[in-house]
Structure formats: structure tokens, C-alpha cells
């Protein structure tokens, strides 16, 4: 099989002319194409890859919201030579973008790297941008973080900046297959220089919860805030963290959890985040809306294809 | 259909700068990667400069660095090329190109820069 | 010097069938890069005849047929006709330039 070989950041590397033909291996039946974009209220971008790959012929489309800051991926397969080049890498204008002036800035101030490299995007080199409120929504928060993708065993990733809804989210993020975008959110201007060393506690919020070990052979009970999850046995050296959720009204789901119970060691998880169950790779953390097939891509909808690992 | 329609090329002394301009027509201009291409009198074509449909990629050829500036302007449908400190070999017909299916699928008529004392 | 090696002149008489060679190096063909060729009627602008090593834009007509081996390509044009007397060049992106390369350009001419 001959597959057409690219890996784009931004709007470079899968542009018309530096497209490659390769041969895939034995074994291999599948070309593959796998498109990620990343809308920010002042612009849009996007990561791709193409190459020969792995799994079974067929389409995934899916849009994804996180804190206001919107990704869409998608995923084509195919089993014929040079097939993987039928999804479109060029993006539609965002209609915000290049039209901020037209927008009332709110008072919060963000670094924002959209579609710039790693080393464009470090600490206060990226350009200032101010906030506003977009199609009914508060931008009043900063966000720092990631998107990645991976196809055709190739991990592209680009990091992610501007304003968001959310300005408490920590190490939050929304998965496709093979897809992610991830980050934190914080308050007050330019507070999103780095926020990878975030830790889960709010100066609001109550920090760590430590769990004392059982000392009588009587279960003990705790009171979980609503949460009808509770804390399955643990190593005696394991702490406990109690992750309070941030999210607002407008992104909760039913099914969230108040309390979310990281274990360090080998204990599985109790809690966690409650994803979207069901679609192959999917999960993500709870509250998180999936748009899934209905804005961008309507009408495109086609085999969900197995996703080899969520993100 | 699709058109590019060059202008801005003429006479200038070495040294000298000219801004070309290329109109495009019939197409998403917004969507498209651009490039100038050109020719000098009797000999081949050589690629010069290359800008991505945002205009956040550039790339130039190394015997125009630093001279030269591909520019875009979305709104208004319309590719520049800026060139300073002009040299006797930059004269030549300048194509602006549209990149389509991995190539250069449309072209302009050209411009002619002729660069003399 | 270009990067992309083609013979100055190639020439046929109409009906024939002619291959014009472009040689490259592991830097753009070698390295998968995929080829186009142009052609350049005399007084004209470039003209794209074939995209991604063998492909035909609309209105191209089949006796003209492009190939892709290791670092070189070729363009062969069978049932050769007088319109067909022109520049043919052929182009791939290069690594060590970041930018497309051309050959330099072969004038083939149909004699008779």
C-alpha cells in the first residue's frame, strides 16, 4: 500500500507542495488522514498528520468544547493507494477572528498563541490579546495548555493559549481518539504565561484532605458531598487528594461527580472523572460538551473507527 | 473562473525597490497557499517566495532573503511581493502562483522587472 | 544550476513518442516528495500538466504521462503533435531549500 506522508502544525508541513508518498509496511492495509482544529475567540488552527496506519477503513468526525475553547477532530481511513487526502486542512475563517474591534473587551488579558511553535509560545513572548464576551458567553479566564495528535504513529502537538470561560480549570482537557486538548485555566492578566506546574487547589477552596488510616477494625464513613462514590481499600501509604470541580453551570454534566479521589498507588481509581461513555476512545472529563458531528460537520457522519488508546 | 492578475513590475535602478501586486479572482484567496515564481529573460523558472493562506508560514529562496517580503491581504484578495535593494539578476517575469492539488495549478500572465542602470 | 536535472532539448516528429528525464537527489525525490510537470508554450505562462508524480488535471489530454522512481521522474508524450512544441519543466519541494525546486527546463521540438 502507498500512502501520501505529511505531518502539519499550524497551517505549515502538509501544504500542497511538500506532500510525500510512502510505502507502508506488511502487514499495514490502511492509509490514514487525522485532522485536529482549535478555535480560540481570536483565532483558529490546526494539527495534522497522514501516513500509512492502522485499524480499519472508515470516517470519525467530532467537535469538542472545552471551557470555550472549541476543537474539532477528524478521522479518515481508507484502503486504497494514496487515498488519504480527502479532508479539507484549510480553515474556514473564524468569524471573530480579524474582527475583534467589533467586540467590547470585558477587562481580562491573555497570552494567546494560536497555531504558534513551542518556542513562539514560551512564558510572555506571545502576543497580549483582550477578552471579550462571544455568541452569549463570559471570556473572563486565561488558558495554557496543549492539543495533541497522534495517527500514523506520529504525535504531533502545539500549545494552546487565550481566553476562556473557565478561570479555576486545572489540567483539564477533552480526548477524541488519538486527539486531546488539554490545559489549565487562571485569573487575572496575563496569568497564563505557564500554567504547567498548576496544582488542583483554589485559594478559595479548602486545599488537601488527608485520609487517616482506618485505627478500629470498624469501617469508617465519610461524608461525600452528594457524591454517591466512595473510596474503595487503599494501601495504608497512599493519600488521598480531593479534587473539587470548577466547572460552571453551563459546562456540567448530570452525571458529574462533586469530588473527584486520586490515588497515588495501585488502588484504582474511585470516582473520576465521568466522561462520555461508549464512544471508542472517547471518555474525557465530565461536563464536557460534545458537539459530536452536529456544527462543523453535519451530515458526515460514517463508521466510528476503534481508537487504539484515547489520547 | 480562476484569474491572477500581476502589476507593479516596470523599470528600476539597482538598489532600488518595487512592490508587485497579484489580484485574485474566482477562488477562496483565503484558503489558498500563494507563491511568486519567476523568470528570468531566456532561462528557467525559479520559485522566490512562498506564504501560507493565513500568512503565518513564509518562505523565501536564499537568493532573496532578506530582500524580499511576501505579504497577504485577505480581505482584499490580493498577494504583494516587496522588493528592495534590487540586483541586475532579480529582472525577470514574476508569475504569482496559486498552490492547488500539491502544485501550481493556476498562474498569472506576469510582470516584467527589469533592473538596470 | 538547478537542483532538478533535465536535458537541455528533446525533440520527435508528430506521431512519435518522447520522454523527458528530471533527476533529483535524496533531498526532494529521493525523499518521496512527489513530482509536477508544467508547460510553457512559447510567449506564455507556465501551465500545471501533471500533479502528484502521474495525475491528469481536467482539459490535459492522456498522451501525456508522467513516472516516479527513486530520485528521478519522467514525462512521456506519446502521439506527439506541432502544439506541443514547448518548455516542459518539472518541480518537487525540497528539503535542504524548504522550498519547491524546478528543473531547468527541457524545449522539446517537433520536427517535419
Known amino acids: 500500500l502507498e500512502c501520501y506522508s505529511c505531518v502539519q502544525k499550524a497551517d505549515d508541513g502538509c501544504s500542497p507542495h511538500r506532500m510525500k508518498t510512502v510505502k507502508c509496511g506488511p502487514g499495514v492495509d490502511v492509509c490514514t488522514e487525522a485532522v485536529g482544529a482549535v478555535e480560540t475567540i481570536h483565532g483558529q488552527f490546526s494539527v495534522a498528520v497522514r501516513g500509512c496506519g492502522s485499524g480499519i477503513p472508515g470516517k470519525n468526525d467530532r467537535g469538542l468544547d472545552l471551557h470555550g475553547l472549541l476543537a474539532f477532530f477528524q478521522l479518515q481511513q481508507c484502503s486504497e493507494d494514496r487515498c488519504n487526502a480527502k479532508l479539507n486542512l484549510t480553515l474556514r475563517g473564524l468569524n471573530p477572528a480579524g474582527n475583534e474591534s467589533a467586540y467590547e473587551p470585558n477587562g481580562a488579558e491573555c497570552y494567546s498563541c494560536v497555531g504558534l511553535s513551542r518556542e513562539k509560545c514560551q512564558g510572555s513572548m506571545p502576543p497580549v490579546v483582550n477578552c471579550y464576551n462571544a455568541s452569549g458567553r463570559v471570556y473572563k479566564g486565561c488558558f495554557d495548555g496543549n492539543v495533541t495528535l497522534t495517527a500514523a504513529n506520529v504525535t504531533v502537538s502545539l500549545p494552546v493559549r487565550g481566553c476562556v470561560q473557565d478561570e479555576t480549570c486545572t489540567r483539564d482537557g477533552v480526548t477524541g481518539p488519538g486527539f486531546t486538548l488539554s490545559g489549565s485555566c487562571c485569573q487575572g492578566p496575563r496569568c497564563n504565561a505557564d500554567l504547567r506546574n498548576k496544582t488542583y487547589f483554589s485559594p478559595r477552596i479548602p486545599p488537601l484532605v488527608l485520609l487517616p488510616p482506618p485505627t478500629t477494625a470498624a469501617p469508617s464513613t465519610r461524608a461525600q458531598n452528594s457524591s454517591s462514590t466512595t473510596s474503595t481499600a487503599a494501601p495504608t501509604t497512599t493519600t488521598s487528594i480531593i479534587k473539587p470541580t470548577t466547572a460552571q453551570a453551563s459546562h456540567t454534566s448530570p452525571h458529574e461527580m462533586d469530588l473527584e479521589v486520586i490515588q497515588e498507588e495501585g488502588a484504582s481509581l474511585s470516582g473520576g472523572a465521568a466522561g462520555h461513555g461508549g464512544t471508542a476512545g472517547h471518555g474525557g472529563a465530565a461536563g464536557h460538551q460534545d458537539r459530536s458531528n452536529m456544527e462543523k460537520y453535519p451530515g458526515k457522519g460514517g463508521a466510528q473507527i476503534p481508537a487504539k488508546g484515547g489520547s | 473562473e480562476v484569474q491572477l492578475l500581476e502589476s507593479g513590475g516596470g523599470l528600476v535602478q539597482p538598489g532600488g525597490s518595487l512592490r508587485l501586486s497579484c489580484a485574485a479572482s474566482g477562488f477562496t484567496f483565503s484558503n489558498a497557499w500563494m507563491s511568486w515564481v519567476r523568470q528570468a529573460p531566456g532561462k528557467g523558472l525559479e520559485w522566490v517566495s512562498y506564504?501560507?493562506?493565513?500568512?503565518?508560514?513564509?518562505y523565501y529562496a536564499d537568493s532573496v532573503k532578506g530582500r524580499f517580503t511576501i505579504s497577504r491581504d485577505n480581505s482584499k484578495n490580493t498577494l504583494y511581493l516587496q522588493m528592495n535593494s534590487l540586483r541586475a539578476e532579480d529582472t525577470a517575469v514574476y508569475y504569482c502562483a496559486r498552490e492547488g492539488l500539491w502544485a501550481f495549478d493556476y498562474w498569472g500572465q506576469g510582470t516584467l522587472v527589469t533592473v538596470t542602470s | 544550476q538547478s537542483v532538478l536535472t533535465q536535458p537541455p532539448s528533446a525533440s520527435g516528429t508528430p506521431g512519435q513518442r518522447v520522454t523527458i528525464s528530471c533527476t533529483g537527489s535524496s533531498s526532494n525525490i529521493g525523499a518521496g516528495y512527489v513530482v509536477h510537470w508544467y508547460q510553457q508554450l512559447p510567449g506564455t505562462a507556465p501551465k500545471l500538466l501533471i500533479y502528484d508524480n502521474n495525475k491528469r488535471p481536467s482539459g490535459v489530454p492522456d498522451r501525456f504521462s508522467g513516472s516516479k522512481s527513486g530520485t528521478s521522474a519522467s514525462l512521456a508524450i506519446s502521439g506527439l503533435r506541432s502544439e506541443d512544441e514547448a518548455d516542459y519543466y518539472c518541480a518537487a519541494w525540497d528539503d535542504m531549500l524548504n522550498g519547491p525546486v524546478f528543473g531547468g527546463g527541457t524545449k522539446l521540438t517537433v520536427l517535419g
Open positions: 506564504i501560507s493562506s493565513s500568512g503565518s508560514t513564509i
